[in-house]
C-alpha cells in the first residue's frame, strides 16, 4: 500500500458544497475507489469491464459521483464545520496487474466563506 498526500488540488468548492477529486492512472481499466473520512468509508465506486469493452459501475455506499478516464469525483453538499477532517482516496487497482492499493489524501479546511447557508 502506497500512502501519500495528493499532489494535485483535491478539494474544489462550489455552491456550499465540495468536489473531492480522486485521480487514478489512465492505464487503469478496472478499479475500486473509496473515499475515506478519517478511517470511515463515505463513498465507494467500482468500475469493471467485460468483453467488448462493456463497462459496469457499482456503488455500494452511494454518493453523488462522477467518473472520467483518470479520476473519480465525489460530491459532498451542505458543508458545515463537522466536514473538516482528513479525507483519503483509497484506490484498489485490479486491472492491469499487479494488484495494488494506493492511499492519497489531504485535510479539508472549512472556512466561513465556503459554508452553504451563512448568517448575514
Amino acid at each position: 500500500e502506497i500512502n501519500g498526500s495528493a499532489n494535485y488540488e483535491m478539494f474544489i468548492f462550489h455552491n456550499g458544497g465540495v468536489q473531492i477529486l480522486c485521480k487514478y492512472p489512465d492505464i487503469v481499466q478496472q478499479f475500486k475507489m473509496q473515499l475515506l473520512k478519517g478511517g470511515q468509508i463515505l463513498c465507494d465506486l467500482t468500475k469493471t469491464k467485460g468483453s467488448g469493452n462493456t463497462v459496469s459501475i457499482k456503488s455500494l455506499k452511494f454518493c453523488h459521483s462522477q467518473l472520467s478516464n483518470n479520476s473519480v469525483s465525489f460530491f459532498l453538499y451542505n458543508l458545515d464545520h463537522s466536514h473538516a477532517n482528513y479525507y483519503f482516496c483509497n484506490l484498489s487497482i485490479f486491472d492491469p496487474p499487479p494488484f495494488k492499493v494506493t492511499l492519497t489524501g489531504g485535510y479539508l479546511h472549512i472556512y466561513e466563506s465556503q459554508l452553504c447557508c451563512q448568517l448575514k
Epitope: 475500486k32 467500482t46 469493471t48 469491464k49 459496469s56 457499482k58 485490479f94 486491472d95 492491469p96 499487479p98
Partner: antibody, heavy 124, light 107 residues
C-alpha cells in the same frame, strides 16, 4: 470460511439439457465476478463462461456460445449454468470459481476459490 | 486466441530439489495477465501466482513466477512433499485459456 458448492450434474443424452448451480457461502457474493471452468477427468482445464457482479456482463468460450447461459441470483448467493444442446465433448467436471480480487469482474482477473466440481456426462 | 505450451510435460525430481516449469504463449500476453495454478489429484486447482510474478494470498515464498511477453517461468525453490502435483499456467486477459499442464512427480 469461503465455500463454493456445485450441484446439478448427472448423465444426460446428447441434445439434452442440464442446469448447474453453485451455492456460495462465507463471502459477500456480489463483490465477486464468477466463472465456470471445466475439466475432462485426467485432462486439462477449459474456461467455459464468466459473469460480473450483477449479471450485466457475461462471456462464453467459443465452444459453448449459443448453447450455454450463465446467470446469477445475488439474493440467493447462487451462480447458474444452463446447458442446452449438450454434446459428448461437454462431458467434464464443472467447477465454479470466483475472482481473486473481489473486483466484481470476471474479465482480466485470475480465479482463487474453486468449488469441488459437479460431473456432467453426456452419453447415449 | 492465445495458445499456451508448457514444458516439460513431466518433471521427475526429489524433495529438496529446485523445479523450473516453463510456459510459452503463441503471442504476447499483454500486461502480464498470466497465472499459475497447482492441482492435486481429486482436488480443485489452487491459485499460486498472478500477474506473472505476484504470489497469491497464503502461498509460501518458495514459489516464484517470472517472465513477460511470451515466456514465463514458475520456480519452486526447494520441493516439499506436498508440492508434487500438476501445474497449469493460464492467460487471463480477455478470454481465459489454460496450458496443458506440467506434472511434477517424485523421482
Amino acid at each position: 470460511e469461503v465455500q463454493l458448492v456445485e450441484s446439478g450434474g448427472g448423465v444426460v443424452r446428447p441434445g439434452g439439457s442440464l442446469r448447474l448451480s453453485c451455492a456460495a457461502s462465507g463471502l459477500t457474493f456480489d463483490d465477486y465476478g464468477m466463472s465456470w471452468v471445466r475439466q475432462v477427468p485426467g485432462k486439462g482445464l477449459e474456461w467455459v463462461s464468466g459473469i460480473n457482479w450483477n449479471g450485466d456482463n457475461t462471456d462464453y468460450a467459443d465452444s459453448v456460445k449459443g448453447r450455454f447461459t450463465i446467470s446469477r441470483d445475488n439474493a440467493k448467493n447462487s451462480l447458474y449454468l444452463q446447458m442446452n444442446s449438450l454434446r459428448a465433448e461437454d462431458t467434464a467436471l464443472y467447477y465454479c470459481a470466483r475472482d481473486y480480487y473481489g473486483s466484481g469482474s470476471y474479465y482480466n482477473v485470475p480465479f482463487d476459490y474453486w468449488g469441488q466440481g459437479t460431473l456432467v456426462t453426456v452419453s447415449s | 486466441e492465445i495458445v499456451l505450451t508448457q514444458s516439460p510435460g513431466t518433471l521427475s525430481l526429489s524433495p529438496g530439489e529446485r523445479a523450473t516449469l516453463s510456459c510459452r504463449a503463441s503471442q504476447s500476453v499483454s500486461s502480464s495477465y498470466l497465472a499459475w495454478y497447482q492441482q492435486k489429484p481429486g482436488q480443485a486447482p489452487r491459485l499460486l501466482i498472478y500477474g506473472a510474478s505476484s504470489r497469491a494470498t497464503g502461498i509460501p515464498d518458495r514459489f516464484s513466477g517470472s517472465g513477460s511477453g511470451t515466456d514465463f517461468t514458475l520456480t519452486i525453490r526447494r520441493l516439499e512433499p506436498e508440492d508434487f502435483a500438476v501445474y497449469y499456467c493460464q492467460q487471463y486477459g480477455s478470454s481465459p485459456f489454460f496450458g496443458p499442464g506440467t506434472k511434477v512427480d517424485i523421482k
